[in-house]
């Protein structure tokens, strides 16, 4: 009976740091800590109410984190950046859709660079580094009334607590504002050894 | 000795729901249940023997689940849909390849919308919602004898038992029927808190 | 106290093969083994110092595994191939960027097939099988001074110890040599039942 009860606390959560927990405190502390340390994740969808204009590369700062498909756990979204709260190896991904319909008006140029850059910023060393990029040059001629293009990138990266992930795109005014179209996210896969 | 033996059952499977298991029944039940509750996954590859003929958006219902790279575990494939058997957060992905060779005949139009939509349907609320979309408008002119284009989408979503995942595409008759070309899948990453 | 200590060893590592460990040896062995068996992963970035020429399909053999974003753990990189050391189900991914600037000279043809193939080779059966492919035919006309295109593929596969993953591309001389542009990787998600 006693063994079973103790095991319930320990084994109940898949991702606890049991060794540390059991040395540092009581079984109750362990249970609390195991909950806090559940694997972090985020899936952020574009908030199109505040999309920058222009065709240059801009950082997208408006994302939803708690409506529709958007969600976050054990990570923080602040000032347009996804902040890591827990060291680990994470799979990062982004899906970015661009579209143009002739009813939106004429494009300034028919030759476009439609690009995404997923970047990491460290607070300690305040510089930004691109983790992943993708995209395409496109010729969106007036012969077609509608144009569409999507980019997907993904990769596995070591992230430290406090580091920030952000997304930059070119031609932000062409972004598709649907939650199924333009989003990015992360989920922790494993601890750092 | 006794403790060790009991632990073998409990810890042996990484993904057991130990708390529930230990309250509900014996160690033997726990071992059985731990096997049943192993992390679900699926990788489904296109079955091109029954591709719809239109150019409009259609749901693809013919997929392989047990040949070549295709496989499924703790999920169900039925009526063209991937059914979730275990609540959790899943990474979903799809790779869709379209191709055309001049020997296949003349395209009805050279301006194509090549798109994929990964959708979720809930039995309780019988409506379909698009989780992810991707694709591109393409101009596949007769100047080139061969055309090819691939789409990849992926994202992290909360799925409940009984929910169904399906894939819709435009221009299904242009799909590349190879198992390495057109597929979709899912794997569970973590439980819902 | 004794129970707690034993539990520390067992539960401390999320990904141990506890049953095997406890049968085969002492608690100390178990702790060591748990470290060795931590979930494998790799993220390899292109080493552009040795890119093949030509426009045909070639295997890319030069990748970084320990600089910048590149890293590897419990997998081996040898002779241009990523070697699996631990049976399991893995998520595999690749991101391949192609680019051309007019300052690089004229393209031999403006009609290009820009493709990636992620392949698996088994030492026991020395044949190569394509797990994933993606890409696009492109018309990179001289009207534009710069062209760019990226491909992303990903999927979930059963891999056995000793199997090798490699990446083939067409038009390798057009590859973008940046570490954020051209890379591939894998991470283990779960054991084989």
């Amino acid at each position: 009976g006693a063994v079973q009860k103790e095991l319930q606390h320990i084994v109940g959560s898949q991702h606890i740091r049991a060794e540390k927990a059991m040395v540092d405190g009581s079984w109750l502390d362990l249970a609390k800590r195991s909950k806090l340390e559940a694997q972090p994740f985020a899936h952020l969808t574009i908030n199109a109410t505040d999309i920058p204009t222009g065709s240059h590369k801009v950082s997208l700062s408006s994302w939803y984190h708690d409506r529709g498909w958007a969600k976050i756990s054990n990570m923080t979204f602040s000032n347009g950046k996804l902040i890591v709260n827990q060291d680990g190896f994470y799979y990062l991904y982004a899906n970015i859709c661009f579209r143009h319909h002739e009813t939106s008006g004429d494009l300034a140029t028919e030759y476009l660079q439609l690009m995404v850059y997923v970047t990491k910023t460290s607070i300690k060393i305040p510089s930004s580094h691109t983790l992943m990029k993708g995209g395409s040059t496109k010729y969106w001629s007036g012969n077609s009334e509608f144009h569409f293009y999507s980019i997907n990138v993904g990769g596995f990266f070591k992230l430290r607590s406090g580091e920030e992930i952000s997304v930059e795109v070119s031609n932000p005014s062409l972004l598709d504002p649907d939650q199924d179209a333009t989003y990015f996210g992360a989920f922790k896969v494993r601890d750092i050894d | 000795g006794a403790v060790q033996k009991e632990l073998q059952h409990i810890v042996g499977s990484q993904h057991i729901r130990a708390e529930k298991a230990m309250v509900d029944g014996s160690w033997l039940d726990l071992a059985k249940r731990s096997k049943l509750e192993a992390q679900p996954f699926a990788h489904l590859t296109i079955n091109a023997t029954d591709i719809p003929t239109g150019s409009h958006k259609v749901s693809l219902s013919s997929w392989y689940h047990d040949r070549g790279w295709a496989k499924i575990s703790n999920m169900t494939f039925s009526n063209g849909k991937l059914i979730v058997n275990q609540d959790g957060f899943y990474y979903l992905y799809a790779n869709i390849c379209f191709r055309h060779h001049e020997t296949s005949g003349d395209l009805a139009t050279e301006y194509l919308q090549l798109m994929v939509y990964v959708t979720k349907t809930s039995i309780k609320i019988p409506s379909s919602h698009t989780l992810m979309k991707g694709g591109s408008t393409k101009y596949w002119s007769g100047n080139s004898e061969f055309h090819f284009y691939s789409i990849n989408v992926g994202g992290f979503f909360k799925l409940r038992s009984g929910e169904e995942i399906s894939v819709e595409v435009s221009n299904p008759s242009l799909l590349d029927p190879d198992q390495d070309a057109t597929y979709f899948g899912a794997f569970k990453v973590r439980d819902i808190d | 106290g004794a129970v707690q200590k034993e539990l520390q060893h067992i539960v401390g590592s999320q990904h141990i093969r506890a049953e095997k460990a406890m049968v085969d040896g002492s608690w100390l062995d178990l702790a060591k083994r748990s470290k060795l068996e931590a979930q494998p992963f790799a993220h390899l970035t292109i080493n552009a110092t040795d890119i093949p020429t030509g426009s045909h399909k070639v295997s890319l053999s030069s990748w970084y595994h320990d600089r910048g974003w590149a890293k590897i753990s419990n997998m081996t990189f040898s002779n241009g191939k990523l070697i699996v050391n631990q049976d399991g189900f893995y998520y595999l991914y690749a991101n391949i960027c192609f680019r051309h600037h007019e300052t690089s000279g004229d393209l031999a043809t403006e009609y290009l097939q820009l493709m990636v193939y992620v392949t698996k080779t088994s030492i026991k059966i020395p044949s190569s099988h394509t797990l994933m492919k993606g890409g696009s035919t492109k018309y990179w006309s001289g009207n534009s001074e710069f062209h760019f295109y990226s491909i992303n593929v990903g999927g979930f596969f059963k891999l056995r110890s000793g199997e090798e993953i490699s990446v083939e591309v067409s038009n390798p001389s057009l590859l973008d040599p940046d570490q954020d542009a051209t890379y591939f990787g894998a991470f283990k998600v779960r054991d084989i039942d």
Partner: antibody, heavy 121, light 107 residues
């Protein structure tokens, strides 16, 4: 069920115009190319015109080129044939027919309407 | 323009007979050929497309073969419902042409 229903036929004098309609139901109209085929009394079948699923491409038989116009309204699931400068040899039963493939030409016509009669005299 | 020549123009046969109708194209059309059945006062019905593919719902006694310039429609065992006129139809370069038809009548 899948159905095509033609209307708009009738008797018309040479040189005049007529517009035929074809109402589609039971399938995704916007996903398929559509044809007009005619059959003069006691004669064989003659292909008249075709339009792609999105309306971007239209092709005509030499015998009607410049006089007939094929069009479609996907929001109304309706196909049209505007016939101008009608001649006596245009007298026929006019069928609308669905292309078997929406993406490719050449796969045949798998659904046909019952036809509407046009008499030019 | 590519011409389509069907033969024979009329064919008399009995129930249970094996019937073959031929269609010749004046130029190579690959396998872009379809076969239709039409009964008096009715719309045509697609039987075969791409020279040899059987349309859904069509009885398996109907089959098509050939490529290039010579094509055949075969009815392996003629049934009472099969007495009708049969048309071949070719596709080539955004143009469709029907053959003149073959009438299959009761002997």
């Amino acid at each position: 069920q899948v159905q095509l229903v033609e209307s708009g036929g009738g008797v018309v004098q040479p040189g005049r115009s007529l517009r035929l309609s074809c109402a589609a139901s039971g399938f995704t109209f916007s996903g398929y190319g559509m044809h007009w085929v005619r059959q003069a009394p006691g004669k064989g079948l003659e292909w008249v015109a075709v339009i792609s699923y999105d309306g971007t491409n239209k092709y005509y038989a030499d015998s009607v080129k410049g006089r007939f116009t094929i069009s479609r309204d996907n929001s109304k699931n309706t196909l049209y044939l505007q016939m101008n400068s009608l001649r006596a040899e245009d007298t026929a039963v006019y069928y609308c027919a669905k292309s078997l493939s929406g993406t490719y030409w050449g796969y045949g016509m798998d659904v046909w309407g019952q036809g509407t009669t046009v008499t030019v005299s | 323009d590519i011409q389509m020549t069907q033969s024979p123009s009329t064919l008399s046969a009995s129930v249970g007979d094996r019937v073959t109708i031929t269609c010749r194209a004046s130029q190579n059309i690959g396998n872009w050929l379809a076969w239709y059945q039409q009964k008096p006062g009715k719309a045509p019905k697609l039987l075969i497309y791409k020279a040899s593919s059987l349309e859904s719902g069509v009885p398996s006694r109907f089959s098509g073969s050939g490529s290039g310039t010579e094509f055949t429609l075969t009815i392996s065992s003629l049934q009472p419902d099969d007495f009708a006129t049969y048309y071949c139809q070719r596709y080539n370069s955004y143009s469709w042409t029907f053959g003149q038809g073959t009438k299959v009548e009761i002997k």
